[in-house]
């Protein structure tokens, strides 16, 4: 089986990858807190895509620590009992209920920083995270629907005469595959137990003046475009892998 070489039949056309930083956060600085105080308290829930293997920091509503009675994080992960991490300011005590994942911790001492951190985000961290700040005037909430993103592994190869296969393996969520030019395509999705999806698109081009085809893979973690020369070699299977 002859693998296509990057300098001739298979080449990277564009690789626009939004490389997430090693640590991502939706927290605001003190200036933003002052400006957006009431707005943030109204925006109770946030959907937050986070790339796998990065660190994530989740923040509580911007309430002055001196006004606090209790800070609590409620963590609801699929198939697990609700985990509660609480800090009672007046007695300087912390308490945990049903919390088993050691990668989910307070950023520092809760009396200094109420934020929650997830070290090395994994697929299992998909879920809902909610900070409740208890004050004498009521509870203030901030919730995150955390969606863990997994970059798919992309491959493109020719498996039959004038037929190419583009695969986005084990992505989360599912990648979208499109072709230039459009061919006679069939797309199949395969769902894995860990929540990832493999998308396989097989296309055939009857028109003989199409010599090069491009597979474009769109994903929340970044887009990849590959092209391949359609070689009229019966039985030959040209392939390459892109990391």
């Amino acid at each position: 089986e002859g693998a296509a070489q990057p300098n001739n039949s298979l080449m990277l056309q564009t690789s626009k990858e939004n490389h997430a930083l090693a640590s991502s956060s939706l927290c605001m600085d003190e200036k933003q807190i002052t400006q957006n105080y009431s707005k943030v308290l109204a925006e109770v829930n946030t959907s937050w895509p986070v790339k796998m293997a990065t660190n994530a920091v989740l923040c509580c509503p911007p309430i002055a620590l001196r006004n606090l009675i209790i800070i609590t994080w409620e963590i609801i992960l699929r198939g697990q009992p609700s985990c509660t991490k609480a800090y009672k300011k007046e007695t300087n005590e912390t308490k945990e209920t049903n919390c088993t994942d050691e990668r989910i911790t307070w950023v520092s001492r809760p009396d200094q920083n109420s934020d929650l951190q997830i070290r090395t985000v994994a697929i299992t961290h998909d879920g809902y995270y909610r900070c409740i700040m208890v004050t004498p005037d009521g509870n203030f909430h901030r919730g995150y629907h955390l969606q863990v993103l997994v970059t798919p592994e992309v491959t493109l190869f020719q498996n039959r005469n004038r037929t190419a296969v583009c695969k986005a393996v084990a992505g989360k969520p599912a990648a979208h595959i499109s072709w230039i030019p459009e061919g006679d395509c069939a797309t199949k999705q395969e769902y894995w137990s860990n929540g990832t999806v493999t998308v396989k698109s097989t296309c055939h081009w009857e028109v003989h003046n199409v010599s090069t085809v491009t597979c474009h893979v769109s994903h929340l973690t970044g887009n990849k475009s590959l092209y391949i020369e359609l070689l009229p070699v019966p039985g030959a299977k040209k392939s390459a892998k892109l990391y």
């Epitope: 007695t91 308490k95 208890v134 004498p136 005037d137 509870n139």
Partner: antibody
């Protein structure tokens, strides 16, 4: 069994201070829990006023502002309510109560032991 | 502050009957509602907390239901000692607030 008993003057003059004592038996108030004051007005409306916790920290209903103070005497196993600048609207039955044991600190704010209550009338 | 509206204010029933008392919160308090029984000169009794959890010592004829803003205390097969004043209390947030009370009287 934990028992609470309120005591204090049944009549207070307007603009003066109302002072009540809650004596706790069967448990040492410095060992745990939060200890609260609640009142019931004529017509049966109930109002949570505030608490002192086992470490001595307090939390008051914001609308009572600077009028309220809850303190304690650990040697006598008692905690106290002082309400300043009272008016006839403060006429009520005053209860002391113990918060339920905290399971996760949050939302466990209900009362499993109460005193029988003491009636206070504010009138000249 | 969360307003708690309790109804009815008075309820008349006979022993053996079933009754329901309603409590409505002005905002979503999830399941965090407690019910108390009050009798003159006696300490209040905690009956139910977290909407439906029976406190130790509460007879099984008492039950609580509801979520969000609407809650119900149901007493089945009323006993003579069940008559008195009943209160709901939200324990979702500070300041803690109570319903206006329901007086359960013997017919």
């Amino acid at each position: 069994e934990i028992q609470l008993q309120e005591s204090g003057p049944g009549l207070v003059k307007p603009s003066q201070s109302l002072s009540l004592t809650c004596s706790v038996t069967g448990y040492t108030i410095t060992s745990g829990y939060d200890w609260s004051w609640i009142r019931k007005f004529p017509g049966n409306k109930m109002e949570w006023m505030g608490y002192i916790n086992y470490g001595g920290s307090t939390n008051y209903k914001p609308s009572l502002g600077s009028r309220i103070s809850i303190t304690r005497d650990t040697s006598k196993n008692q905690f106290f309510l002082q309400l300043n600048s009272v008016s006839p609207e403060d006429t009520a039955t005053y209860y002391c109560a113990k918060y339920n044991e905290y399971k996760s600190y949050i939302y466990d704010w209900y009362f499993d032991f109460w005193g029988p209550g003491t009636m206070v009338t504010v009138s000249s | 502050e969360v307003q708690m509206t309790q109804s009815p204010s008075t309820l008349t029933a006979s022993p053996g009957e079933s009754v329901s008392i309603n409590c409505k919160a002005s905002k979503n308090i999830r399941s965090y509602l407690a019910w108390y029984q009050q009798k003159p000169g006696k300490p209040n009794k905690l009956l139910i907390y977290s909407g439906s959890t029976l406190h130790s010592g509460t007879p099984s004829r008492f039950s609580g239901s509801g979520f969000g803003t609407d809650f119900t205390l149901t007493i089945r097969n009323l006993e003579p000692e069940d008559f008195g004043l009943y209160y709901c209390q939200q324990h979702h947030e500070y300041p803690l607030t109570f319903g206006s009370g329901t007086k359960l009287e013997i017919k």
